[in-house]
Amino acid sequence: MGRARDAILDALENLTAEELKKFKLKLLSVPLREGYGRIPRGALLSMDALDLTDKLVAAYLETYGAELTANVLRDMGLQEMAGQLQAATHQ
């Protein structure tokens, strides 16, 4: 796995427990690119940051997974963290 996966994991590990919960809830309704499916709710809500990173990369691949993660962070008001994530993936 590469740089984008590490950047996603780094971002998710920096969320508080409350923020990680909110991230998952927003992920359930975030607008997706055509052709991509949603991670099932049941599986999602019990995941920790590491499991969630793996699931995001498996479902959306690294590049889109990082973009989607950044957008959910922006939806949460965490624009700075989103920018850091995207900067790390484009290095």
Partner: antibody, heavy 114, light 107 residues
């Protein structure tokens, strides 16, 4: 419809400070509008965890705080000059995606004059 | 900081006209653009978010479009109550920034 409660007017002397309040929830933004001008974002604060973000332009003069017990956000504006005479709005971001400001207070008109 | 440029600064129009307001971002902001309507002596009101999503209760004559750097607010048939200032704003990066506004006036 959520109503964000803000006091109507404040008259302060140059060099003094003023503390503006807003009954709100979630992310609360503070926005400045001088007469006949556009909107300027001062910063925001998350009422649940106290996380703040500032526009560097206002970092030296604005301090954002929250009182969780009363769900009230505050901005203290210090060392005021005539350039700070403006309407100050608080606004909430409650829409789940794209972080728009969907609820706005009626604004507090601050006049800086001796 | 991301600069949001709105044009035209003002427009004089007749009731029933179709109006196109434009907003240009100085860098890519994805779909993180909102449009706000502000009437004299009132606070701004959200019309469109995510570039194209109409906010609750907003009449369907208001339509938002665009992505990346170029955004449009269209009012298909302007009504008297639409005469106001319109601000675009981006929420892609901090600091959040707004355009200088476009004023719609009666001809």
């Amino acid at each position: 419809q959520v109503q964000l409660q803000q006091p109507g007017t404040e008259l302060v002397k140059p060099g003094a400070s003023v503390k503006l309040s807003c009954r709100a929830s979630g992310w609360t933004h503070w926005v400045k509008q001088r007469p006949g001008q556009g909107l300027e974002w001062i910063g925001n604060i998350n009422l649940s965890n106290g996380r703040t973000n500032y526009n560097e332009k206002f970092r030296a003069m604005a301090t954002l705080t929250v009182d969780k017990s009363s769900s009230t956000a505050y901005t203290q504006l210090s060392s005021l000059t005539s350039e700070d005479s403006a309407v100050y709005y608080c606004a909430n971001s409650m829409v789940p995606h794209f972080f728009p400001m969907d609820y706005w207070g009626q604004g507090t008109s601050v006049t800086v004059s001796s | 900081n991301i600069v949001m440029t709105q044009y035209p600064k003002s427009m004089s129009l007749s009731i029933g006209e179709r109006v196109t307001l434009r907003c240009k971002a100085s860098e890519n902001v994805g779909s993180y653009v909102s449009w706000y309507q502000q009437k004299p002596e009132q606070s701004p009101k959200l019309l469109i978010y995510g570039a194209s999503n109409r906010y609750t209760g907003v009449p369907d004559r208001f339509t938002g479009s665009g992505s990346a750097t170029d955004f449009i607010l269209t009012i298909t048939s302007v009504q008297a109550e639409d005469l106001a200032d319109y601000h675009c704003g981006q929420s892609y990066n901090y600091p959040l920034t707004f355009g200088a506004g476009t004023k719609l006036e009666l001809k």
